[in-house]
Interface confidence: medium
């Protein structure tokens, strides 16, 4: 599991691999702060509720964020 509260940042290891948006239950973006100097993106998968840390610099992940925000803006009135 790439998550730990024992370090300053939540994510220990990050994935560069793309994520199918249909597999996502939730996408959490934690901004950089005094506790962790980098942006962290945590994906909760529908299957087994497994959590994965995604690389914010990966083009595939940037595209995913775009797709998710586009979907959200469609839903909001």
């Amino acid at each position: 599991v790439p998550l730990s509260r024992t370090v300053r940042c939540t994510c220990i290891s990050i994935s560069n691999q793309p994520v199918n948006p249909r597999s996502l239950e939730k996408l959490e973006i934690i901004p950089a702060s005094q506790f962790c100097p980098r942006v962290e993106i945590i994906a909760t998968m529908k299957k087994k509720g497994e959590k994965r840390c995604l690389n914010p610099e990966s083009k595939a992940i940037k595209n995913l964020l775009k797709a998710v925000s586009k979907e959200r803006s469609k839903r909001s009135p």
Partner: antibody, heavy 119, light 107 residues
Amino acid sequence: EVQLVQSGAEVKKPGATVKISCKVSGYTFTDYSMHWVRQAPGKGLKWMGWINTETGEPTYADDFKGRFTFTLDTSTSTAYMELSSLRSEDTAVYYCARNYDYDGYFDVWGQGTTVTVSS
Amino acid sequence: DIQMTQSPSSLSASVGDRVTITCKASQDINKYIAWYQQKPGKAPKLLIHYTSTLQPGIPSRFSGSGSGRDYTFTISSLQPEDIATYYCLQYDNLLFTFGQGTKLEIK
């Protein structure tokens, strides 16, 4: 040295099933997603889809949904592509290709596996 | 899906010639294009990614340029060993698409 080594050529009858393997070496298998590409005789390259090597989740291109199955054996660092209900138009060379996920292009390819479907 | 229109489909040139192949995307692909060389019976070989970044070990006679929807691949001085089929690949989104290919022959 990073290598993707595919299984040998196959000759199958229509309606049969074929399973191609792609064994990787020289890098950590689960660090990169694996993609599959088809090339029919005398034709161009067609992207078939990919499998996330961390989760095992496959994604298929529209033209390759239904009869195609991508799987993994992480213990042997091997990706598989299975094709069922073979037809003559499935005759092609099938390539596995490592995706350089941080940017998304295919940087290393297998040597290709020729599948011939003939009665 | 993004379509990639590659031209010409074939071309004949002499050793030493400057050769240009183009790929036009159906929408802006943000410079996410790669170029591959494929010789008969062999797997494609990556030459260039992100429009113009040459892979290590690839001769400098190969180059790429472009932006938006229009991209160009150039061989500045054609060598006999460059005889092959060349493909562009767009990887701007997770539905990858190749151009139709350009078969390059020596005059």
